[in-house]
């Protein structure tokens, strides 16, 4: 499929001008190669009319130009002084005309309307409102006022001052007679339909002395705005329908066959299943404008989208609308990222999030998509050291491995963590990706005690048992804080007895805290990694209490408290508005949630290893 994209149909009127924008993937080769606009012949072939290399056909001399915008990946063809002879099938493309790197464009130039003298032209968008003004003289002030529409050869009454309304206009038309002294009546038609277009006649009086005024109503179907986005990327549709529909239900729909427009999302709570987890309808402003964000773009998302306002939350005749034609470029620079990551209940997941490599200094974020209402994505963590309170001790965003990827680790998984999460940055908004976390049945591989209590001034040893599956990987302990997980020194020696059917390759790695202080209280993680890639993690909370009896503490799996109950998320938590996702700098206020716990002094912590039987009480 050609990655070149432009308007499928361009309509204009004789004597007018058109501007045609064609999009291409902005690779180095594409930016510099020849751009052309050619007309397709009846027997195939395409005759160049204008190109970026300076060629202009005699048919276009003095009335056309082609401008390349390499930084945008677009070029624009402007054609003036259009005639009906310009109607036909064209191609805009790159390279050689016959190579196939092109897009077909149909140009239709129609004759201008043959208007009667003294005709007032009203040009109004579909779904909007028109006011047709009709002047009259004093002698007709008390006489019947009427509006007719010319249907073929005959005028058909639309509305009059005696109360008649043509059934085609019921509920959306009124006739207003201005106050005395103003010799004017007006007809207001709402929710304009394409079928309303045509020639109208206002009349005051019915005899030979009546006043008449001709009006030509042109109802414009909105030209779709062209949107060119990368596969797996993100698109935002900004919809501004005007304050008159501020309180009417809004929708975004995708045109399918014929005139059908299938609702993608609306403000009444409807959402198409194909967009679950990857769409947000951002709250509307007072002026009735709103925006819809779709991430994880797929090939099948390409097509024509309409946004509109109607009490039913779907397209109806007379809905004011805005249109887009979305093209999804399959030659994407956005890497494939996982669409699903599965984790075992009680264990962890490590999610790799791609970002634009040119923006390594951008702030990274991770949010949880919520389907309630119109979809929202409250932040859970960022790369600046903020973690949502309910996720303390079990969520970390790491800049590793870098170079276009960051890592998010979430542990202590419960069924409540299943859902859709978004990776995003405060840089390129196109690089928003969605991942679904699924919780599967199974047992965590790493075995650690539940809650552990350390005694001030004493030594604490906490075991972590690694199965043989991880024999060839680096094992570590670290202390969690809101900026990451600071590694503690580690040694790996000795098999664990915690696994059945596991050979000598299993390992017991113990964390030793010498002379425990209050600063040692907090979450500790043990885990496996390979270079900058993280595998499973397990979390232990170490509480610190006053000395009761002298000695040191050695925690075994059996002795440790049971794992704490899963945290219940507070339903009243503050949420970041979706608008902030457009500009994550707006999240700054959330940073006020400071982590008051001190970081442990790494010099007093050590990790040692040994078999289960060898775990002595003394510190080394």
């Amino acid at each position: 499929k050609s990655p070149i994209f432009g308007p499928e149909e361009v309509n204009s009127v004789e004597g007018n001008s058109v501007s045609i924008t064609c999009y291409y993937p902005p690779t180095s080769v594409n930016r510099h190669t020849r751009k052309y606009w050619c007309r397709q012949g009846a027997r195939g072939g395409c005759i160049t009319l204008i190109s970026s290399e300076g060629y202009v056909s005699s048919k276009y001399a003095g009335r056309a130009n082609l401008t390349n915008f390499p930084e945008n990946g677009t070029f624009v063809v402007n054609i003036a002084q259009l005639s009906q002879d310009d109607s036909g099938r064209y191609k805009c493309g790159l390279g050689i005309n016959s190579r196939g790197l092109s897009f077909d464009v149909s140009l239709e130039v129609s004759q201008g309307p043959g208007l009667l003298n003294d005709t007032k032209v009203y040009t109004v968008d579909l779904g909007r409102t028109v006011t047709i003004n009709c002047p009259f003289k004093t002698e007709n002030a008390q006489k019947r006022k009427s509006l007719y529409k010319q249907i073929g050869l005959y005028p058909v009454l639309v509305i009059d001052s005696s109360g008649y309304v043509n059934p085609n206009y019921t509920g959306r038309i009124r006739l207003d007679i201005q106050g005395t002294g103003q010799l004017l009546f007006s007809v207001v038609i709402n929710q304009l339909r394409l079928s309303d277009a045509g020639q109208y006649l206002c009349q005051a009086g019915d005899d030979s002395n009546s006043n008449k005024k001709n009006a030509d109503l042109q109802v414009l179907k909105p030209e779709p705005e062209l949107v060119y986005e990368d596969l797996r990327g993100s698109v935002t549709f900004h919809c501004a329908l005007g304050p008159e529909v501020a309180n009417v239900a809004k929708f975004l729909c995708r045109q399918s066959s014929g005139e059908n427009c299938d609702v993608v999302v609306n403000t009444l709570g409807k959402r198409a299943p194909a967009f679950e987890g990857r769409i947000l309808l951002n709250p509307q402003d007072k002026d009735g404008s709103f925006s819809v964000v779709i991430t994880g773009l797929r090939k099948e998302d390409a097509g024509r989208y309409l946004c509109g306002a109607h009490s039913d939350g779907q397209l109806q005749e007379g809905s004011p609308i805005q249109a887009w034609q979305l093209f999804v470029n399959e030659e994407s620079t956005i890497p494939r990222s996982p669409t699903v990551v599965k984790g075992v209940a009680g264990s962890s997941v490590a999610v790799l999030c791609p970002y634009n490599r040119k923006e390594s200094k951008s702030i990274k974020y991770w949010c949880l998509w919520e389907g309630a209402q119109n979809g929202r994505c409250p932040l859970l963590v960022d790369s600046e050291g903020w973690v949502k309170a309910q996720y303390e001790g079990r969520l970390s965003l790491l800049e590793e491995p870098g170079n276009g990827t960051f890592t998010v680790i979430l542990n202590q998984l419960t069924s409540r963590d299943a859902g859709f999460y978004w990776c995003l940055t405060n840089g390129d908004t196109l690089w928003r990706t969605t991942v679904e976390i699924k919780i599967i049945e199974g047992e965590p591989n790493l075995k650690v005690p539940g809650n552990v209590t350390a005694v001030l001034g004493e030594t604490l040893k906490v075991p972590c048992h690694f199965p043989c599956k991880f024999s060839s990987y680096e094992k570590y302990w670290c202390k969690w804080n809101n900026t990451g997980c600071q590694a503690l020194p580690s040694q790996d020696e000795g098999p664990s007895k915690a696994f059945v059917n596991c050979d000598e390759n299993s390992r017991l790695v113990s964390l030793t805290l010498n002379l425990v202080t209050r600063a040692d209280e907090g979450w500790y993680w043990c885990g496996v990694k390979q270079g900058h890639f993280y595998g499973e993690t397990a979390a232990v909370y170490v509480a610190v209490e006053e000395r009761k009896a002298a000695g040191s503490r050695d925690v075994s799996l059996a002795k440790a408290d049971a794992a704490p109950d899963e945290k219940v998320l507070d339903s009243g938590f503050r949420e970041i508005e979706n608008k902030a996702i457009q500009d994550p700098r707006l999240f700054a206020e959330e940073k006020a949630v400071a982590d008051t716990r001190d970081q442990a002094d790494g010099s007093r912590a050590s990790v040692d290893s040994g078999s289960s039987e060898e775990q002595g009480g003394s510190s080394r």
């Epitope: 494939r336 599965k342 984790g343 999610v351 790799l352 599967i440 049945e441 499973e536």
Partner: nanobody, 138 residues
Framework: QVQLVESGGGLVQAGGSLRLSCAAS????????MGWFRQAPGKEREFVAV????????YYADSVKGRFTISRDNAKNTVYLQMNSLKPEDTAVYYC???????????????????????????????WGQGTQVTVSS
Amino acid sequence: QVQLVESGGGLVQAGGSLRLSCAASGRTFSSYAMGWFRQAPGKEREFVAVISWSGGSTYYADSVKGRFTISRDNAKNTVYLQMNSLKPEDTAVYYCASGEQPGSNRPYIPEQPIEFMPTDYPSWYDYWGQGTQVTVSS
């Protein structure tokens, strides 16, 4: 949807060899990690081996390590299990399974070790074949 069809099972004497194949059709084969499981009569389904989408990472159950080899040919949409030094306790129905692997086919990101995913649990996999019987006689 992904359809998986196993073949190559049969009766073999202890110490012998068999090569199982699993042909995949449907969605992009190269996006999926492929695993083999087995189920002996009256026992639970047991993990045997798994191979990452690229073939660059493999992981085996301890009971088959050194005797079985998993491999794949993405051009043929097929995964193989070469079973050598077979034992009577290897008798079971062998199932092929596939699960979408995070990061597959990404231009910029090297793949994570397959052990870092819970691929030894049947619930990790999205699609399953019907199975092929392997019987090892003593």
